[in-house]
Interface confidence: low
């Protein structure tokens, strides 16, 4: 069974998938569609790297542009380095400015909904 066929079989169960499953899926050439991606748990999407999301979505990665103001895409963008987002060529804005450090302060993030940044 190839990646696409496997994805079709598990698609209906993906809404609650944890980050680990999404990372594994990104290695299987599944080409997840945007509608499915938008239904994923925000907390599962946030830890994914730009490269992992690109692999997970395949040709559908371009759909991120249309969804950049909606969750979970909006929140995921806020967690990515702008440099990394730029490699997608989508014109996605709102990433962590180049030269900033990301402090993984869980309480701060839980309160504000965004990562704590230290300036250059």
């Amino acid at each position: 069974m190839n990646g696409s066929e496997y994805f079709v079989k598990i698609q209906s169960f993906l809404g609650g998938a944890p980050t680990e499953d999404l990372k594994a899926l990104s290695q299987q050439n599944v080409s997840m569609d945007l509608a499915t991606f938008m239904k994923l748990r925000t907390d599962a999407v946030l830890p994914l790297t730009v490269a992992e999301v690109q692999k997970l979505l395949g040709p559908h990665v371009e759909g991120l542009k249309a969804e950049e103001r909606h969750r979970p895409v909006r929140d995921w963008i806020l967690r990515q380095r702008q440099d990394d987002l730029d490699t997608l060529g989508l014109g996605l804005q709102g990433g962590i400015p180049n030269g900033y450090l990301v402090l993984d302060l869980s309480m701060q993030e839980a309160l504000s909904g965004t990562p704590c940044l230290l300036g250059p």
Partner: antibody, heavy 120, light 107 residues
Framework: QVQLQQPGTELVKPGASVKLSCKAS????????MHWVKQRPGQGLEWIGN????????NYNEKFKNKATLTVDKSSSTADMQLNSLTSEDSAVYYC?????????????WGQGTLVTVSG | DIVMTQSQKFMSTSVGDRVSVTCKAS??????IAWYQQKPGQSPKALIY???YRYSGVPDRFTGSGSGTDFTLTITNVQSEDLAEYFC?????????FGGGTKVEIK
Amino acid sequence: QVQLQQPGTELVKPGASVKLSCKASGYTFTSYWMHWVKQRPGQGLEWIGNVNPSNGGSNYNEKFKNKATLTVDKSSSTADMQLNSLTSEDSAVYYCAPHYIGSRPGFAYWGQGTLVTVSG
Amino acid sequence: DIVMTQSQKFMSTSVGDRVSVTCKASQNVGTNIAWYQQKPGQSPKALIYSASYRYSGVPDRFTGSGSGTDFTLTITNVQSEDLAEYFCQQYNSYPLTFGGGTKVEIK
């Protein structure tokens, strides 16, 4: 005005390699994937793969993984495709076609194509 | 890989008539389909994206329809300049794949 310059013809010997170029102008080179498509005389179109000029990342059709290597030179806005170990099966027209990530993924623009003839 | 099948290799029509070129995908591709026109000795030209949206500059006699696995490109009021080969292409998943093409001939 989007323009894609490809050399008209390349005559190569069996077993040799050839590097095809596609010089782009009229748009932001790093904002567009560059795709390559093969068309044998009187036959259909085959997608070879694409390359992201921002980071050099690429996707290949499995069939061409050991045949084609896609690269870019950002400084000259040129995409290259190297074909190795050429045989008569590789005699074809090769097109480059950019597509803006974040927009519709059909190929609105095509190069004029390079006719590669493999002949001893 | 997703196989795109254009079962009719040739179609014959007359100026002013209507012709429908069909394309079938081996699995569901939603509306992630494009159509191209290729005239002899020329590069392909994009006509339709997302199954039914015309590229700018494409005459409105070209219309695309369908979703899932079955797609149609319809040319109404066929003109002599429509003599060409027409290809469908899916961009739902890698590798991107094309149909084998349908040549439209003018009687």
